[in-house]
């Protein structure tokens, strides 16, 4: 039994880090493998993660962690019984994938403006709380070509757009994701999408 693709890990910079790897053949990850992880400092405990299958030869492990601080560094040991398959380390602050924003809501009652709001996925004391920027994806359910991305580079989790920038009488969906430039993070997963019917008063035209 050998590791084909070494574990790669990402942290939500709060409480979970997720490690994925591939074995050289079909593996029952939960019965055959264990991933041990330990914070590097005196008297720290070793924790054991039981991996789950992620495709035939793929395994995934969710590592529970206390509040992450930038200095945290973990040793990782992948075991198959008594055999050490791989040894590595992981610094959560250097491999961050933010949590997905939540509670995306489209407010359609503000004259002819669409107001999209969502919630910052971190508590106020978390370092990422004040460092997230967002991308909002809006698309038409009727027209696959009607697909747009708005970059929200300010901290407020909201976006205003004129309803007239979208087609009237059509259903649209929106979703949002986050990233933090300060930690050079990857993008979060997309939030669950929300749907609304876009309608606005066409401006009166004089001939």
């Amino acid at each position: 039994m050998k590791v084909l693709q070494e574990p790669t890990c990402v942290s939500d910079y709060m409480s979970i880090s997720t490690c994925e790897w591939k074995m050289n053949g079909p593996t029952n990850c939960s019965t055959e493998l264990r991933l041990l992880y330990q914070l590097v400092f005196l008297l720290s405990e070793a924790h054991t993660c039981i991996p789950e299958n992620n495709g035939g030869a793929g395994c995934v492990c969710h590592l529970l962690m206390d509040d992450v601080v930038s200095a945290d560094n973990y040793t990782l040991d992948l075991w198959a019984g008594q055999q050490l398959l791989w040894k590595g380390s992981f610094k959560p602050s250097e491999h961050v994938k933010p949590r997905a924003p939540g509670n995306l809501t489209v407010h359609t009652n503000v004259s002819d403006t669409l107001l999209l709001t969502w919630s910052n996925p971190y508590p106020r004391d978390n370092y990422l709380y004040n460092h997230l920027t967002y991308a909002v994806n809006i698309w038409s359910e009727n027209d696959p070509a009607d697909f747009r991305i708005y970059n929200v580079t300010y901290l407020e989790p909201s976006l205003r757009i004129a309803a007239s920038t979208l087609k009237s009488g059509i259903s649209y969906r929106a979703r949002v994701r986050a990233w933090a430039q300060c930690y050079n993070t990857t993008w979060s997963e997309w939030s669950p999408s929300t749907k609304w019917h876009n309608s606005y008063r066409e401006p009166f035209e004089q001939h």
Epitope: D66, R99, G102
Partner: antibody, heavy 115, light 107 residues
């Protein structure tokens, strides 16, 4: 091995105060965020409060906000819960529990609020 | 605040039965859900975290699934020591909230 020992419970009248303590051993307390969780007699679990190891930030359940204060003394390996303006509905066994996500619990201390 | 609704609140089952307990969150909590077991007079112990990850040392007959708002704890073959009360917990945001509990009793 990890051990958490709560103390300070007892009988107190409505409107009174009590200070609970939780002494930790078997791990580096200063590196761990901590919680208080309570359980009223015959009822379910209710999270009460949290204090972060990283920032010292604190959070409270709405039911205790403004009345309870969580604190810690890393030099004494101790977690505290100062409970003021106690009410009948605060009667419960109070547990301290370690992060991440309550991986270790103390045995609890009983707080009875009654006249 | 996020509400966690567990069902059923109580159930009777026999040794060897497959038992399923569900937990519904009032809003999306991704996979920030844990399951705890509590026996009478004892402190709770964590069985599952991150919705589906089995806690080390917990028998493999326990499993968790779900994401978002709907979650399930399954005991594939109920053993005598499994008669207890089970709680779900969301830690996606503060305040953290438990479900009201499911008591699994002997039929």
């Amino acid at each position: 091995q990890v051990q958490l020992v709560e103390s300070g419970g007892g009988l107190v009248q409505p409107g009174g105060s009590l200070r609970l303590s939780c002494v930790a051993s078997g791990f580096t307390f200063s590196h761990s965020s901590m919680n208080w969780v309570r359980q009223a007699p015959g009822k379910g679990l209710e999270w009460v409060s949290y204090i972060s190891r990283a920032t010292g930030a604190v959070y409270y359940a709405d039911s205790v906000k403004g009345r309870f204060t969580i604190s810690r003394d890393n030099a004494k390996n101790s977690l505290y819960l100062q409970m003021n303006s106690l009410r009948d509905e605060d009667t419960a066994v109070y547990y301290c529990a370690r992060e991440p996500v309550f991986d270790y619990w103390g045995q609890g201390t009983l707080v009875t609020v009654s006249s | 605040d996020i509400q966690m609704t567990q069902s059923p609140s109580a159930m009777s089952a026999s040794v060897g039965d497959r038992v399923t307990i569900t937990c519904r969150a009032s809003q999306d909590i991704s996979n920030y859900l844990a399951w705890f077991q509590q026996k009478p007079g004892k402190v709770p112990t964590r069985l599952i975290y991150a919705a589906s990850s089995l806690q080390s040392g917990v028998p493999s007959r326990f499993s968790g699934s779900g994401s978002g708002t709907e979650f399930t704890l399954t005991i594939s073959s109920l053993q005598p020591e499994d008669f207890a009360t089970y709680y779900c917990l969301q830690w996606s945001s503060y305040p953290r909230t438990f479900g009201q509990g499911t008591k699994v009793e002997i039929k």
